[in-house]
C-alpha cells in the first residue's frame, strides 16, 4: 500500500522536511504532489513525468520544493504556513491512479525565557512571591527548576496560568534558592538564567557563647552574640538592664565579683523591623584556698589497719572530691566516704593502697587540688623465693642461694638446712659441695614492724647423676598458621647442656624454630600440621645424660578445601549416586550437604538411589572445624541424562 512518511514529523521553522514515499507501484507514468488532503488542481505543488524526467510546478509551488525520481518531496526553509497535509497522486501506465496523504507540523524555535518577580525582597512567614516565565508563547510547555531540581511537592508552591506562573506562599528562609524556568515545544527547549530569591528573615533568638556562666575573679570575660538574620543583625549589649555597647562581642578584662549579673544581647533587623533578646546570668567567684590532706595513721599494717584521710580546711557548702593514682575513686567495699565527702576511709589497707591520694575543693568554676599524699603501708613478708631455681647440683661446685620476700620494711632473712639454723643473711654460700650437702634448705623472712614471718623450703640434690627430664608446654593444642608453642625442658639444672630431638632427629634448621633460655626452651612459631611430631628433650653434664619421654604436638588445622569423589559429573537415569566428601582437618570436620542450596544430611557420604533428571543440580559439601573456627566448602554440578542417552547428547 502506498504510504507517505514525514521526516521529521515536527519541523522547526527555517528547517527542511522530507516527505518520503513507501511502496511506490511499478510501471508508472508520473506523479503529482498537492497541498491538502485531496487532489485539487488549484493546490498542485509540482508534477513529474517519468518518461521525460520533466518536473512541472503547479499553482501551490513556492520555489522551496524539490521532487525526486522516487516521488519523495523535499520542502526547504519551512514556514509556519507549511503545516498540514500533503497528497501524492500517482498515475500508472495503465492510467489507473493511486493516492496517499502525509502530514507534518511546524513549530517556531523558542527564544530564551526570563523570569519576572512581583516581590524582590519578601519577608519570611509574611509575604508571597509570584515568579512569571516570559515571554508568553503559544503551544509551549512551561517547567520550573529549584536549585536545578524539579519542583518539590509542597502546599506552599502553586503553579498557575498554564504553569507559566510559580507562586510561593508564606516564604521561608529555606526558599532562598536558585529558580529557573524552561519553555518547551516539540522542536526546542530553552532555560532561563537563574533568579536567586532573597528572603528577609530574623533575627532569631540570639545565642551567647561561650556557654559557661561561672568565672573566677581576675579572668577576662569575652562574650559573643549571634542571631540568624537577613540582612545581618545589628547587636547591642546590656548589663543588668543598662546599655553597654553596640557590638557583636562584649569584652571585660580582669573581672571581679562585682561583674556578676545578667548580660543581655539584643539583635535587630532593620529590614524586617524585628528585635530579639537573650539573657545569660554570669557569676564571678573569689579564689578558694588550696586544700591539703591529713591522715590518722601514717604507717598502717596491711590487712589489719584502717586509714582515714581528711581534706582540709572545712568549708561550708563545698563539694569535696578525691583521686587515687590520678583516677577518680574506684568502686570498692573497702573505700568509704563520709556524708560530706571530706573524709575518705580505707578499710583493711593493702600494699596497693599506697596512692598517691589527692583531694579537691570544687566551686562552680573549677577544682583546686591538694598536693599528693602517699601512704607507707607495712606489709609482708610474702612467701620468699629462693633463686636460682636449680634443684640438682654436681659435687664439687659452689652452692650460692639467694632469698627474697616482698616486705615493707625490708625483711630480715635466716637460713636453715634440714631444720638447723645456719646464718642470718639474704644469701647462703657453700663452696665445693658434696652429696652430704643434699637436703632441705629453708629461707625464713621476718618483718620486724609487723612481727610476721614466712618460710620457703627447697630440696637440693647433689648428685653426679642427672634426673630424667620432662617436657612442659604452654599450648597443648595450637592452631595452624596462628599459634606459637613453647616447650620447656624440666628441671632447670646447673652446668647442664639441654638438647632437643624431633622424630628422633636433631633439630632441623628453620626460621620458625627458636632455642632460648640456655637451649632449655624450644619455641615453634606459626605452627603447621607438619609440626605434629614427637619432641624429646635431653639433659647432660660431664658425668651423665638423660632423655625425656616423647611429647607429641597436636596441631589443630583445616578444614582444607574438600574434595568430592568420584569426579564424575554426568550420570544416567536409574544409576545410584554415591558422593563422598573429604577434607583434611584436625579434629575431623563436621560434614554437611546441600542440594541446590537445600540442607540435606550431616554425613561424609551422600547416597541417592536410582537417580532421575530431577536430581540434576548443584551438590555442595560443607566442612566445619569448631576448634580452628574455620569453614570450607566445594560445589559440584551433577547432570542426569535419560536412560539410553549419552551424557551431553539428546535423541
Amino acid at each position: 500500500k502506498l504510504t507517505i512518511e514525514s521526516t521529521p514529523f515536527n519541523v522547526a521553522e527555517g528547517k527542511e522536511v522530507l516527505l518520503l514515499v513507501h511502496n511506490l507501484p511499478q510501471h508508472l507514468f508520473g506523479y503529482s504532489w498537492y497541498k491538502g488532503e485531496r487532489v485539487d488542481g488549484n493546490r498542485q505543488i509540482i508534477g513529474y513525468v517519468i518518461g521525460t524526467q520533466q518536473a512541472t510546478p503547479g499553482p501551490a509551488y513556492s520555489g522551496r520544493e524539490i521532487i525526486y525520481p522516487n516521488a519523495s518531496l523535499l520542502i526547504q526553509n519551512i514556514i509556519q504556513n507549511d503545516t498540514g497535509f500533503y497528497t501524492l497522486h500517482v498515475i500508472k501506465s495503465d492510467l489507473v491512479n493511486e493516492e496517499a496523504t502525509g502530514q507534518f507540523r511546524v513549530y517556531p524555535e523558542l527564544p530564551k525565557p526570563s523570569i519576572s518577580s512581583n516581590n524582590s525582597k519578601p519577608v519570611e512567614d509574611k509575604d508571597a512571591v509570584a515568579f512569571t516565565c516570559e515571554p508568553e508563547t503559544q503551544d509551549a510547555t512551561y517547567l520550573w527548576w529549584v536549585n536545578n531540581q524539579s519542583l518539590p511537592v509542597s502546599p506552599r508552591l502553586q503553579l498557575s496560568n498554564g504553569n507559566r506562573t510559580l507562586t510561593l506562599f508564606n516564604v521561608t528562609r529555606n526558599d532562598t534558592a536558585s529558580y529557573k524556568c524552561e519553555t518547551q515545544n516539540p522542536v526546542s527547549a530553552r532555560r532561563s538564567d537563574s533568579v536567586i530569591l532573597n528572603v528577609l528573615y530574623g533575627p532569631d533568638a540570639p545565642t551567647i557563647s561561650p556557654l559557661n556562666t561561672s568565672y573566677r575573679s581576675g579572668e577576662n570575660l569575652n562574650l559573643s552574640c549571634h542571631a540568624a538574620s537577613n540582612p545581618p543583625a545589628q547587636y547591642s549589649w546590656f548589663v543588668n538592664g543598662t546599655f553597654q555597647q553596640s557590638t557583636q562581642e562584649l569584652f571585660i578584662p580582669n573581672i571581679t565579683v562585682n561583674n556578676s549579673g545578667s548580660y543581655t544581647c539584643q539583635a535587630h533587623n532593620s529590614d524586617t523591623g524585628l528585635n530579639r533578646t537573650t539573657v545569660t546570668t554570669i557569676t564571678v567567684y573569689a579564689e578558694p584556698p588550696k586544700p591539703f590532706i591529713t591522715s590518722n595513721n601514717s604507717n598502717p599494717v596491711e590487712d589489719e589497719d584502717a586509714v582515714a584521710l581528711t581534706c582540709e580546711p572545712e568549708i561550708q557548702n563545698t563539694t569535696y572530691l578525691w583521686w587515687v593514682n590520678n583516677q577518680s575513686l574506684p568502686v570498692s567495699p573497702r573505700l568509704q566516704l563520709s556524708n560530706d565527702n571530706r573524709t575518705l576511709t580505707l578499710l583493711s589497707v593493702t600494699r596497693n593502697d599506697v596512692g598517691p591520694y589527692e583531694c579537691g575543693i570544687q566551686n562552680e568554676l573549677s577544682v583546686d587540688h591538694s598536693d599528693p599524699v602517699i601512704l607507707n603501708v607495712l606489709y609482708g613478708p610474702d612467701d620468699p623465693t629462693i633463686s636460682p631455681s636449680y634443684t640438682y647440683y654436681r659435687p664439687g661446685v659452689n652452692l650460692s642461694l639467694s632469698c627474697h620476700a616482698a616486705s615493707n620494711p625490708p625483711a630480715q632473712y635466716s637460713w636453715l638446712i634440714d631444720g638447723n639454723i645456719q646464718q642470718h643473711t639474704q644469701e647462703l654460700f657453700i663452696s665445693n659441695i658434696t652429696e652430704k650437702n643434699s637436703g632441705l634448705y629453708t629461707c625464713q623472712a621476718n618483718n620486724s614492724a609487723s612481727g610476721h614471718s614466712r618460710t620457703t623450703v627447697k630440696t637440693i640434690t647433689v648428685s653426679a647423676e642427672l634426673p630424667k627430664p620432662s617436657i612442659s608446654s604452654n599450648n597443648s593444642k595450637p592452631v595452624e598458621d596462628k599459634d606459637a608453642v613453647a616447650f620447656t625442658c624440666e628441671p632447670e639444672a646447673q652446668n647442664t647442656t639441654y638438647l632437643w630431638w624431633v622424630n628422633g632427629q636433631s633439630l632441623p634448621v628453620s626460621p620458625r624454630l627458636q632455642l632460648s633460655n640456655g637451649n632449655r626452651t624450644l619455641t615453634l612459631f606459626n605452627v603447621t600440621r607438619n609440626d605434629a611430631r614427637a619432641y624429646v628433650c635431653g639433659i647432660q653434664n660431664s658425668v651423665s645424660a638423660n632423655r625425656s619421654d616423647p611429647v607429641t604436638l597436636d596441631v589443630l588445622y583445616g578444614p582444607d578445601t574438600p574434595i568430592i569423589s568420584p569426579p564424575d559429573s554426568s550420570y544416567l537415569s536409574g544409576a545410584n549416586l554415591n558422593l563422598s566428601c573429604h577434607s583434611a582437618s584436625n579434629p575431623s570436620p563436621q560434614y554437611s550437604w546441600r542440594i541446590n542450596g537445600i540442607p540435606q544430611q550431616h554425613t561424609q557420604v551422600l547416597f541417592i538411589a536410582k537417580i532421575t533428571p530431577n536430581n540434576n543440580g548443584t551438590y555442595a559439601c560443607f566442612v566445619s572445624n569448631l576448634a580452628t573456627g574455620r569453614n570450607n566448602s566445594i560445589v559440584k554440578s551433577i547432570t542426569v541424562s535419560a536412560s539410553g542417552t549419552s551424557p551431553g547428547l539428546s535423541a
Epitope: T603, V605, F607
Partner: antibody, heavy 120, light 107 residues
C-alpha cells in the same frame, strides 16, 4: 521416618554375656555411625562406644575395652552390642543411638532402650 | 578423658521463670557441646548441638551459649512440659562423656 528398634529385656547371671540388637530403618544404615550408651537405674548416661556400619570400624570406651564387641549386619540394617563377663553393676538400660552426622556430632535418634538385669 | 561437670544437680522454678544450667569441661572443647532432655521413663532427646545450634522442632525458648570450657543452657520461660533431667555432652572426639545431669522441677 528414622527409627531404631532394640531387642527385648534380658536377665543374665554374673559372668555371662548379653547381646543386644538395634534395627535401623528410615535412613541409609551405612551412612551414619551408631553409638551405644547405657544408663544405670536412677543414674546418668555413660558412653560405651560406636561402630561405623559402612566399614565395621569400632571405637570403645577404655572402661569397656576387652568386654564389649560391636558388630553390624548391613543386609538387615542391624547393629549388635555384646557385653561379656557381666557383673551386677552392668545392670542398666542400654541404648543404641545414631550420630547426627559423621565426626564430632552428637546423637540425634535413640532406640527405645533394652533393660539388662544382672543378678545371681 | 574430658570430664563434664554440670550445675546445679537439681533446681525448682516457677512457670515462666528463666532457668539457667551450666556445664564445665575439664579442658577446651571449643564449641563441641550438646544438650539433651530426658523426661521420666523416656529416651534422651537432642536439643542443642555445637553449643548453640537449636535442633529443628525444639521450642525457641531453649538456647545455648558458651565456648572453650564454660557452657550454658537457658530456658527463657519455663513451661510445665519442660520438667525433665537435662544432660550436657561433649562431642569433641571420643570418648564422648556426659555431665551428671540437672533435674528441673516446677515449684
Amino acid at each position: 521416618q528414622v527409627q531404631l528398634v532394640q531387642s527385648g529385656a534380658e536377665v543374665k547371671k554374673p559372668g555371662a554375656s548379653v547381646k543386644v540388637s538395634c534395627k535401623a530403618s528410615g535412613y541409609i544404615f551405612t551412612s551414619y555411625w551408631l553409638h551405644w550408651v547405657r544408663q544405670a537405674p536412677g543414674q546418668g548416661l555413660e558412653w560405651i562406644g560406636y561402630i561405623n556400619p559402612n566399614t565395621g570400624y569400632t571405637n570403645y570406651s577404655q572402661k569397656f575395652q576387652g568386654r564389649v564387641t560391636m558388630t553390624r549386619d548391613t543386609s538387615t540394617s542391624t547393629a549388635y552390642m555384646e557385653l561379656s563377663s557381666l557383673r551386677s553393676e552392668d545392670t542398666a538400660v542400654y541404648y543404641c543411638a545414631r550420630e547426627y552426622g559423621n565426626y564430632n556430632y552428637p546423637l540425634d535418634y535413640w532406640g527405645q532402650g533394652t533393660l539388662v538385669t544382672v543378678s545371681s | 578423658d574430658i570430664q563434664m561437670t554440670q550445675s546445679p544437680s537439681s533446681l525448682s522454678a516457677s512457670v515462666g521463670d528463666r532457668v539457667t544450667i551450666t556445664c564445665r569441661a575439664s579442658e577446651n572443647i571449643y564449641g563441641y557441646l550438646a544438650w539433651y532432655q530426658q523426661k521420666p521413663g523416656k529416651v534422651p532427646k537432642l536439643l542443642i548441638y555445637n553449643a548453640k545450634n537449636l535442633v529443628e522442632g525444639v521450642p525457641s525458648r531453649f538456647s545455648g551459649s558458651g565456648s572453650g570450657t564454660d557452657f550454658t543452657l537457658t530456658i527463657s520461660s519455663l513451661q510445665p512440659e519442660d520438667v525433665a533431667t537435662y544432660y550436657c555432652q561433649h562431642h569433641y572426639g571420643t570418648p564422648y562423656t556426659f555431665g551428671q545431669g540437672t533435674k528441673v522441677e516446677i515449684k
